[in-house]
């Protein structure tokens, strides 16, 4: 058992059918000695009597608030929820499995930019009595600090007949160094409640593998004369890094059809402009990315060739 | 060239060498689905690694006040990872196959190195760590180990030099 | 602590209608009131619910048929066009007090509401 | 999501004991009541945290099983306890929220 935070404690349970559970000593805050009774959640049903109250934790009907009272009057509170362990994994019944970039991913991190701050999102089908609590920090064995807000429900979808919830949180490390080479790595560590169970979830990476950039701005085309070619032109994204000279940016322009089976065009370019042909109801689209780290592509901005 | 003492380097050759550094180091090792190999265990492989870090005035305002610290960094780095590469890591089995990048990545880090050092000159290199694991297996998670932390390296050293031959070059 | 259903009446297919649910003894502030009917013969079935803080959930079946408002001693449930399928009781309960999504322990004796032509 | 309750309906004879099985389509953890109803009355808590006994309710009725298995046991059975049994998950609106089908039990 340890302390989640004041008067809430998380009991560690092997779960299996019979398994013998843990036996918590639960200690009531006050000077009082005699004419102190227990009792859990709602029920006025007195589970012991004395300063402190034994009981063995097996299943989720034996955690909850332990209240201790004397005289009618409440001495004390302690919130018991429970952490599953089954087959040595710890339980992962609370966010889903977001398969992305591999198994086993509940948490998805994304930066648009080296200056330290990144978002992260996780998903969830439970809409009701669900709590998140985010820290995070710089390596784990001499943490450097990284200060996250409160995640806050960023996005609803509907999914068949079940609603599914999105989770996003904001941090920012306290220290960042933009233009060095990251050696320790950003961990963060989600501790959500349901109900009475507690689960935690983790993610490590560095800053430069989580890098998308946002789409280029100001797309624009310019018709060449007497040719169906036009000039493409594009401005680094506002959220990006600067300097552009040492923050620099690689683009890709790709010319499409109406019909997505249409071959597409594509051009990869240094530059923040480029030539290319325009055909009659294509589109223009052109997308971000890291020039020296093949992290991810920022999503496409687009300007029909019309 | 740099010449250590003060001169600055041909700013545009070594953008064009670093860049060309980004691409081999890529293509030697994409990006297999985002094989996480820090959770094999990192600590006693890519510690001992020299990281441009915060102090080594590689960023832009510290390229503007003395470039050479930064570039003794990214010396020593290239002369460690040209060391690393060359090495039964790297030779010995599973081979590498015979169109394989990291030839290329070899003699490319030699060729930067040489850019920023010439002959005659020397800054101070960092010992190489041996590493000479005992199964292919542990050589294959080691080569996969030693280029994610290349590609890291030298995207910081290009950013250096872009930088460099944008705002720095005579 | 006792809750109880009101305005349960034989109104025509589309005609709206409100029910209520007058409660005393306990604050709505500090508990979950639901919604659920049980046609002739049948299950019960719930039709949504809103919490101590106001917030409203319905059962994926309502899309959009009934709408669940509080004042601070009543809670509302509007059945937009009723059809002659919405024709059951309808009962209002309390929740314990422990969570959102909880079970019930204060129950309405519940109002019938008759749809037909 | 969905609960079954099995059987829809028992026949069990006074001072005997009958079992009502309750499955939920996903796991509920221990998210699970069960009520009572007799005709022309609202239900009755009788379990929650599907063991729990509800204030006022005999002893008589127990309810065990956690994930998705739940099992409500009635010994002693007298003719009052002849009604409909549901069982209820509240484990989440969203994710698992809801009525069973319903036991109807009859006492001979």
């Known amino acids: 058992i340890w302390e989640l935070k004041k008067d809430v404690y998380v009991v560690e349970l092997d779960w299996y059918p019979d398994a013998p559970g843990e036996m918590v000593v639960l200690t009531c805050d006050t000077p009082e000695e005699d004419g102190i009774t227990w009792t859990l959640d709602q029920s006025s049903e007195v589970l012991g009597s004395g300063k402190t109250l034994t009981i063995q934790v097996k299943e989720f009907g034996d955690a909850g608030q332990y209240t201790c009272h004397k005289g009618g009057e409440v001495l004390s509170h302690s919130l018991l929820l429970l952490h599953k362990k089954e087959d040595g994994i710890w339980s992962t019944d609370i966010l889903k499995d977001q398969k992305e970039p591999k198994n086993k991913t509940f948490l998805r991190c994304e930066a648009k930019n080296y200056s330290g701050r990144f978002t992260c999102w996780w998903l969830t089908t439970i809409s009701t009595d669900l709590t998140f609590s985010v820290k995070s920090s710089r390596g784990s064995s001499d943490p450097q600090g990284v200060t996250c807000g409160a995640a806050t429900l960023s996005a609803e979808r509907v999914r068949g007949d079940n609603k599914e919830y999105e989770y996003s949180v904001e941090c920012q490390e306290d220290s960042a160094c933009p233009a060095a080479e990251e050696s320790l790595p950003i961990e963060v560590m989600v501790d959500a409640v349901h109900k009475l169970k507690y689960e935690n979830y983790t993610s490590s990476f560095f800053i430069r593998d989580i890098i998308k950039p946002d789409p280029p701005k100001n797309l624009q085309l310019k018709p060449l004369k007497n040719s169906r070619q036009v000039e493409v032109s594009w401005e680094y994204p506002d959220t990006w890094s600067t300097p552009h000279s040492y923050f620099s940016l690689t683009f890709c322009v790709q010319v499409q059809g109406k019909s997505k089976r249409e071959k597409k065009d594509r051009v990869f370019t240094d530059k923040t402009s480029a030539t290319v042909i325009c055909r009659k109801n294509a589109s223009i689209s052109v997308r971000a990315q890291d020039r020296y780290y093949s992290s991810s592509w920022s999503e496409w901005a687009s300007v029909p060739c019309s | 060239r740099a010449v250590p003492g003060g001169s600055s380097p041909a700013w545009t050759q070594c953008q064009q060498l670093s860049q060309k550094l980004c691409t081999l180091a890529w293509s030697a090792h994409p990006l297999v689905g985002h094989m996480d190999l820090r959770e094999e265990g990192d600590e006693e492989t890519t510690n001992d690694v020299p990281h441009i870090q915060c102090g080594d005035g590689c960023d832009p305002q510290g390229l503007r006040d003395n470039s050479q610290f930064c570039l003794q960094r990214i010396h020593q780095g290239l002369i460690f990872y040209e060391k690393l590469l060359g090495s039964d890591i790297f030779t010995g089995e599973p081979s590498l196959l015979p169109d394989s990048p990291v030839g290329q990545l070899h003699a490319s880090l030699l060729g930067l190195s040489q850019l920023l050092q010439p002959e005659g000159h020397h800054w101070e290199t960092q010992q190489i760590p041996s590493l000479s694991p005992s199964q292919p297996w542990q050589r294959l998670l080691l080569r996969f180990k030693i280029l994610r932390s290349l590609q890291a390296f030298v995207a910081v050293a290009a950013r250096v030099f872009a930088h460099g031959a944008a705002t720095l070059s005579p | 602590q006792s809750v109880e259903e009101s305005g349960g009446r034989l109104v025509t297919p589309g005609t709206p209608l409100t029910l209520t649910c007058a409660v005393s003894g306990f604050s709505l502030s500090g508990y979950t009131m639901i919604w659920v009917r049980q046609a002739p013969g049948e299950g019960l079935e719930w039709i949504g619910i809103i919490s101590s803080s106001g917030n409203t959930y319905y059962a994926s079946w309502v899309k959009g048929r009934f709408t669940i408002s509080k004042t601070s001693t009543t809670v509302d449930l509007k059945m937009i066009s009723p059809t002659t399928e919405d024709t059951a009781t309808y009962f209002c309960?309390?929740?314990?007090?422990?969570?959102?999504?909880?079970?019930?322990?204060?129950w309405g004796p519940g109002t019938l509401v008759t749809v037909s032509s | 999501f969905e609960l079954t309750q099995t059987p829809s309906s028992v026949e069990a004879a006074v001072e005997g004991t009958v079992t009502i099985k309750c499955q939920a389509s996903?796991?509920?953890?221990?998210?699970l009541s069960w009520y009572q109803q007799k005709p022309g009355q609202p239900p009755k808590l009788l379990i929650y945290s599907a063991s729990k006994l509800a204030p006022g309710v005999p002893s008589r009725f127990s309810g065990s099983g956690s994930g998705t298995q739940f099992t409500l046991t009635i010994g002693d059975l007298e003719c009052a306890d002849a009604a409909t049994y549901y069982c209820?998950?509240?484990?989440?609106?969203?994710?698992?929220?809801?009525f069973g089908g319903g036991t109807e039990v009859v006492v001979v």
């Open positions: 209820q998950s509240y484990y989440d609106v969203n994710a698992g929220y809801g």
């Open positions: 996903q796991s509920i953890d221990s998210w």
């Open positions: 309960a309390r929740g314990s007090g422990a969570y959102i999504s909880d079970y019930f322990n204060v």
